[in-house]
């Protein structure tokens, strides 16, 4: 199809080489009440849908994305040629940064209902650059945490080194929906709830004497509880002796509860004490059996394929540890009588 009639938007993605970050393009089909591009059911201002950036199509998931090769070749269907780019409804997600993402991206409705609709398309010229500005060492991360129940803020990474006074007007989106009230480089959240979690996009306009373009950054926000102040506790085994039958297989389970930690490095292991010798048990590995916002329960078994007389003289020790400290529980095997 002829893309000369598409409305054009220029975007800049400046990515940090230090961190993993994502990027999104919205299918900003022109709004029907403002534009002659899309001739379809007119919406009165009261009927404006919640997700403003892509209002051109009635079924917003029904859009097609293409990339325009720089050598003038025909348009390429994004889904077929670019595995690191994912289409989710009318949003294009770039999973990995890199200058190779630079180029022209075109979106249009899949269903062309009238001859006028041929021109109902948007061409987005995306320029991708690595961040070179070393003067701003502490720019906001593309992954930000908000502590549940407290006051927090979400900063626009591309503007976080500017004061609020210097900052240009910012347009914020959360999960693809316009946050019309927010216009500064920081969203302040008075009290954090779990619904504040999501993908936030901040846009601002930059211009020179020739043209203007949108600078965009994507922030993944997660809501978390505060780091635990407690060492893990062992839920099982509770008893320090266990009655067993000689010659039979035995599995002893160690279950421990670990409180939430942002940097989570849980240890749960078994080791065996036999007089002055001690050794670890490397298999099987640990597995998480229950995970909530506040804590995680992890289990690790020790498997004795056949209980021997020697095992009755040994101590089987479950050891659990987090950044606060460690806890142990030892089990002595006792032969079942009768």
């Amino acid at each position: 199809f002829n893309i000369s009639g598409c409305s054009t938007k220029k975007l800049l993605w400046t990515y940090s080489t230090r961190s993993e970050e994502e990027f999104v393009l919205f299918c900003d089909l022109p709004e029907p009440q403002k534009s002659h591009f899309c001739h379809r059911n007119r919406l009165s201002p009261k009927q404006v849908p919640e997700h403003l950036p892509f209002m051109g199509s009635n079924d917003l998931s029904d859009v097609q994305w293409y990339q325009q090769p720089s050598n003038g070749d025909p348009l390429e269907d994004i889904r077929k040629s670019y595995p690191h780019i994912i289409q989710d409804k009318c949003t294009l997600h770039f999973l990995t940064p890199g200058v190779n993402n630079s180029g022209s991206y075109i979106c249009r409705p899949k269903m062309i209902k009238s001859p006028y609709d041929v021109a109902c398309c948007v061409k987005m010229i995306l320029e991708v650059k690595p961040q070179t500005n070393a003067s701003c060492e502490y720019s906001a991360s593309h992954k930000q945490d908000l502590l549940l129940g407290s006051t927090g803020s979400i900063s626009c990474p591309s503007l976080s080194c500017q004061s609020d006074a210097q900052s240009p007007a910012v347009t914020w989106y959360k999960n693809g929906k316009l946050l019309s009230v927010e216009r500064s480089n920081r969203i302040v959240v008075d009290e954090v709830y779990d619904y504040h979690q999501g993908t936030y996009v901040c846009d601002y306009t930059q211009s020179d004497t020739v043209s203007s373009w949108t600078v965009r950054a994507v922030v993944q926000v997660r809501t978390i509880v505060g780091d635990t102040k407690l060492k893990p506790d062992i839920l099982d085994p509770v008893e320090d002796t266990l009655e067993v039958e000689l010659g039979k297989p035995l599995t002893i389970s160690c279950k421990a509860r670990f409180g939430f930690e942002r940097v989570f490095n849980p240890v749960i292991k078994w080791y065996i004490k036999d007089s002055d010798l001690e050794w670890e048990v490397s298999v099987p590995e640990a597995k998480s059996i229950k995970s909530t916002l506040k804590d995680e329960i992890i289990e690790r078994n020790i498997i004795l394929e056949k209980v021997t007389q020697r095992d009755l003289r040994r101590k089987f020790v479950c050891f659990v540890q987090n950044s606060i400290g460690n806890t142990t529980q030892s089990v002595q095997l006792k032969e079942k009588r009768g």
Epitope: K269, E278, E280, S282, E285, A286, L304, F319, Q321
Partner: antibody
């Protein structure tokens, strides 16, 4: 003591089984494992068979490598071999029944995979 | 999971000197770490297990320390016989790991 055998020159895709012959070690009390080392490179863990016969593998070895044992031997069966599998293969004894701390090692057997 | 990073890759030390080799785990492994010595054309030899316990017959010049994610092997009063490649190995998990060994450190004596 431990001694590996069965290493030889094979073409890609050929299956191969290595044997570790054990003397003076009770395989019903100790874990046994296989570790390999490509020429001029570091050690790479393959997997373990526990004293009771349960097997566990490195993630890259799952499905292509199989460890089994008899009362005096520990075997490593390898399938779909590629040139990347060219290495000296060692068998080793674990400190305990399910331990991957290797306290006794065999001298190794060389497997060369070449076209 | 449990990737092991060993530094330096190579080190040159004088006879009688001391060398320190570091090993870092990508996740906490408590004290589940072993150190091995390997000489050219020979299988590895266990030096230290559970981070600091000397294996049978290993001289006390070899000292292991650390816990969690940071570990160190220190060899003091270096002898010619200590010229070898040293490997750390996590012994916390023997399944679903890419490789339990570090990349190795070559100790060259001058």
């Amino acid at each position: 003591s431990l001694e590996e055998s069965g290493g030889r020159l094979v073409t890609p895709g050929t299956p191969l089984t290595l044997t570790c012959t054990v003397s003076g070690i009770d395989l019903s009390s100790y874990a046994m494992g296989w570790v390999r080392q490509a020429p001029g490179k570091g050690l790479q863990y393959i997997g373990i068979i526990t004293y009771g016969g349960s097997t566990y593998y490195a993630s890259w070895a799952k499905g292509r490598f199989t460890i089994s044992k008899t009362s005096t031997t520990v075997n490593l069966k390898m399938t779909s071999l590629t040139t990347e599998d060219t290495a000296t293969y060692f068998c080793a004894r674990g400190l305990g029944g399910a331990s991957t701390t290797w306290d006794i090692w065999g001298p190794g057997t060389l497997v060369t995979v070449s076209l | 999971a449990y990737d092991m990073t060993q530094t330096p890759a190579s080190v040159e030390v004088a006879v009688g000197g001391t060398v320190t080799i570091k090993c870092q785990a990508s996740e906490s492994i408590s004290v589940n770490l072993a150190w091995y010595q390997q000489k050219s054309g020979q299988p590895p030899k266990l030096l230290i297990y559970l981070a600091s316990t000397l294996a049978s017959g290993v001289p006390s010049r070899f000292k292991g320390s650390g816990s969690g994610t940071e570990f160190t092997l220190t060899i003091s009063d270096l002898e010619c016989a200590d010229a070898a490649t040293y490997y750390c190995q996590q012994t916390y998990s023997g399944s679903n790991v890419e490789n339990s060994f570090g990349g190795g450190t070559e100790v060259v004596l001058k």
